[in-house]
Interface confidence: low
């Protein structure tokens, strides 16, 4: 049956899917608060632009009886059930915000004719790449892969004079939703990461990981894992680690590293942490005071989804264009809009661009310091600390293969970013 969109005559509605299975275990009340805060901002912006229209959100809850595991692994059908609810009510907003789980987003995209835009806080997996009406407001796996390949190839920085072509990936199946899909992308045999690396092995057992740390016959010195410092400590403990081991800890949605009083524990000295550049004003926001750092990013993505809709609505209304058209559905990409915490850029495929930050532990201060940053929009690495106080020999990152001779480094007088 044809679902009518409540999206004309000065009244514009946002359908927000409130799913029991979510990328992050966030109370739905917090997401409602984020959406409502976003609505207030959008109304103000439209009013300032002289557009006298009504913007509201309809929250659509799943019944929670069938799909109540709380995590994403059982979410495939939940999104479709919610779409059926919309279909039964024959009422749909101008835009769909949610779902956040890769499985449900992928299934919803397959099973519906999406003539309206879908905005997701999550949907991290490669299966949600290149979807014409899907916008993702949290860094998807593709962006991580591009950073890693770029960083592996870099060989002309004062602290990284070797190209790397090998890696171990630790993935034991208990990861959070974001980590699950990030590691999945690295594991996939047909992914860009796998294509660019000469050697890659996935470690699935704790013991495998622990053995590699001191194994003289290891095939790579580099281990990628995903999670926070506590997760690493549970696995590694205070075990001895060979001096040329480098652990890359992917912990994108955690800005605790940037807090003033944080001291890096000793077990983090062989670790480079990949995280996102921290926001500025979120800590004081009414909806985020009680949120953990990860959940703050999740709630922010919901809020920014509302602001993105407001941005597009304003443009189309000012140009006198119809909102219920394929043009509107396909417009949520290749743009920059004013997010809650500053400008937000979406790439050609509607995926959020961001500044990734690689941190190291200073052996002098025991503080996390920024080694380099990476702008996903232009696929470039920018060095920040040209003389890092590393634990590694000569304050340089080691070669990825023990015993391999030096490879061509950078030029003598100039240091360049990649």
């Amino acid at each position: 049956s044809q679902v009518s969109q409540n999206c004309h005559n000065g009244s514009y509605e946002i359908s927000v899917l409130m799913m029991g299975n979510s990328a992050f275990a966030e109370p739905l009340k917090n997401l409602e608060d984020a959406v409502n805060e976003g609505l207030e901002i959008v109304r103000g912006r439209l009013q300032n632009a002289g557009l006298n229209v009504t913007v509201n959100a309809t929250f659509m809850y799943s019944d929670g009886l069938i799909h109540n595991s709380g995590d994403c692994r059982s979410s495939t059908c939940e999104g479709l059930d919610l779409l059926r609810k919309i279909s039964n009510a024959q009422r749909m907003g101008c835009v769909l915000i949610g779902p956040s789980c890769t499985y449900s987003t992928f299934q919803m995209y397959l099973d519906t004719e999406l003539s309206y835009p879908m905005i997701s806080a999550g949907s991290f997996g490669l299966s949600c790449d290149y979807k014409e009406t899907l916008t993702r407001l949290m860094s998807p796996a593709r962006k991580l892969m591009y950073f890693l390949v770029n960083f592996w190839k870099t060989n002309d920085l004062p602290f990284k004079t070797y190209s790397w072509s090998t890696s171990y990936v630790y993935k034991n199946g208990t990861e959070t939703e974001d980590c699950f899909w990030y590691l999945n992308a690295l594991e996939a045999s047909v992914s860009y990461f796998s294509h660019e690396l000469g050697f890659k092995v996935v470690l699935r057992q704790d013991k495998e990981f622990q053995d590699i740390l001191m194994d003289h016959n290891r095939k790579s010195n580099v281990i990628i894992m995903c999670g926070g410092p506590e997760f690493l400590y549970k696995l590694k403990g205070d075990r001895a680690v060979a001096e040329d081991i480098v652990i890359i800890l992917v912990d994108l949605f955690n800005d605790q590293y940037f807090e003033d009083n944080v001291t890096a524990p000793d077990y983090m000295k062989n670790v480079l942490v990949l995280t996102l550049s921290p926001g500025n004003s979120l800590l004081n926001s009414s909806f985020s005071r009680n949120l953990s750092p990860t959940k703050r990013d999740f709630a922010l993505a919901y809020l920014n989804g509302i602001l993105l809709f407001g941005h597009m609505l304003k443009i189309f209304l000012e140009n006198g264009e119809n909102i219920t058209t394929p043009k509107f559905a396909h417009a949520f990409r290749n743009l920059t809009f004013e997010g809650y915490d500053g400008p937000v850029t979406l790439d050609d495929w509607g995926d959020v661009d961001s500044t990734m930050v690689l941190l190291y532990t200073s052996v002098d201060t025991k503080k996390y310091k920024v080694l380099l940053t990476y702008d996903t929009h232009v696929n470039k690495t920018y060095p920040v600390d040209m003389s890092p106080t590393f634990t590694w020999k000569n304050s340089k990152l080691p070669n990825d293969i023990t015993g391999r001779g030096p490879q061509g480094g950078g030029g003598s007088e100039n240091l360049y970013f990649q």
Epitope: T373, G411, E413, N414, Y416, Q418
Partner: antibody
Framework: EVQLVESGGGLVQPGGSLRLSCAAS????????MHWVRQAPGKGLEWIGE????????NVHEKFKDRFTISVDKAKNSAYLQMNSLRAEDTAVYYC???????????????WGQGTLVTVSS | DIQLTQSPSSLSASVGDRVTITCRAS??????????MQWYQQKPGKAPKLLIY???KLASGVPSRFSGSGSGTDFTLTISSLQPEDFATYYC????????FGQGTKLEIK
């Protein structure tokens, strides 16, 4: 002495092609980013794109992606700009430049070539 | 792209004058405590020459009468006491996201 020298400019008909060269000397070419910037008569500077000789990673501005290609020959310490489907509005002086990154982590265009004039006219 | 707007577009001044040119970016060009903004001088028929990098750092060989300031979106180039050789066109440039230049400010003799 650090130097960049462009060549290959001249008169070309609309729809035609031209390949500009930039010969680099006096510095380690392979680890730099080499750029092309143009300036139409009486107008401002417009960035076209860049290439990193060490791994031939290129970034070309959206405006030029379909028609312009940047390449390098590391053996010759040279960068190239291949321009196809030329239009009258491509008439400009084309400069080759490089970015350096200082030890403090800043980057900018510090050395420029003298420029080569491309005129697109029938 | 980040847009850069320079003002004024042209300016007449005399030798010895203090001159200020401003450049406004469409979004912040700050990056980890640095402002990725440069100023270049260009004379007719010549290539641009770097004057200031990172908003306020003087490039090698540039006279100290040139100075730069600003952060975020608003930047200024100041020439404290104009010399005859300073009459030229000045461009600001950002390297925060790709590379864009301002439209230029032509500094002429009054």
């Amino acid at each position: 002495e650090v130097q960049l020298v462009e060549s290959g400019g001249g008169l070309v008909q609309p729809g035609g092609s031209l390949r500009l060269s930039c010969a680099a000397s006096g510095f380690t070419f392979s680890s730099t980013w080499m750029h092309w910037v143009r300036q139409a008569p009486g107008k401002g500077l417009e960035w076209i794109g860049e290439i990193k000789p060490s791994n031939e990673l290129t970034n070309v501005h959206e405006k030029f992606k379909d028609r312009f290609t940047i390449s390098v020959d590391k053996a010759k310490n040279s960068a190239y700009l291949q321009m196809n489907s030329l239009r009258a509005e491509d008439t400009a002086v084309y400069y080759c430049t490089r970015t350096i990154t200082t030890t403090e982590g800043y980057w900018f265009f510090d050395v420029w070539g003298q420029g080569t004039l491309v005129t697109v006219s029938s | 792209d980040i847009q850069l707007t320079q003002s004024p577009s042209s300016l007449s001044a005399s030798v010895g004058d203090r001159v200020t040119i401003t450049c406004r970016a469409s979004e912040s060009v700050d990056y980890y405590g640095s402002s990725l903004m440069q100023w270049y001088q260009q004379k007719p028929g010549k290539a641009p020459k770097l004057l200031i990098y990172a908003a306020s750092k003087l490039a090698s060989g540039v006279p100290s009468r040139f100075s730069g300031s600003g952060s975020g979106t608003d930047f200024t180039l100041t020439i404290s006491s104009l010399q005859p050789e300073d009459f030229a066109t000045y461009y600001c440039q950002q390297t925060r996201k790709a590379y864009t230049f301002g439209q230029g400010t032509k500094l002429e003799i009054k």
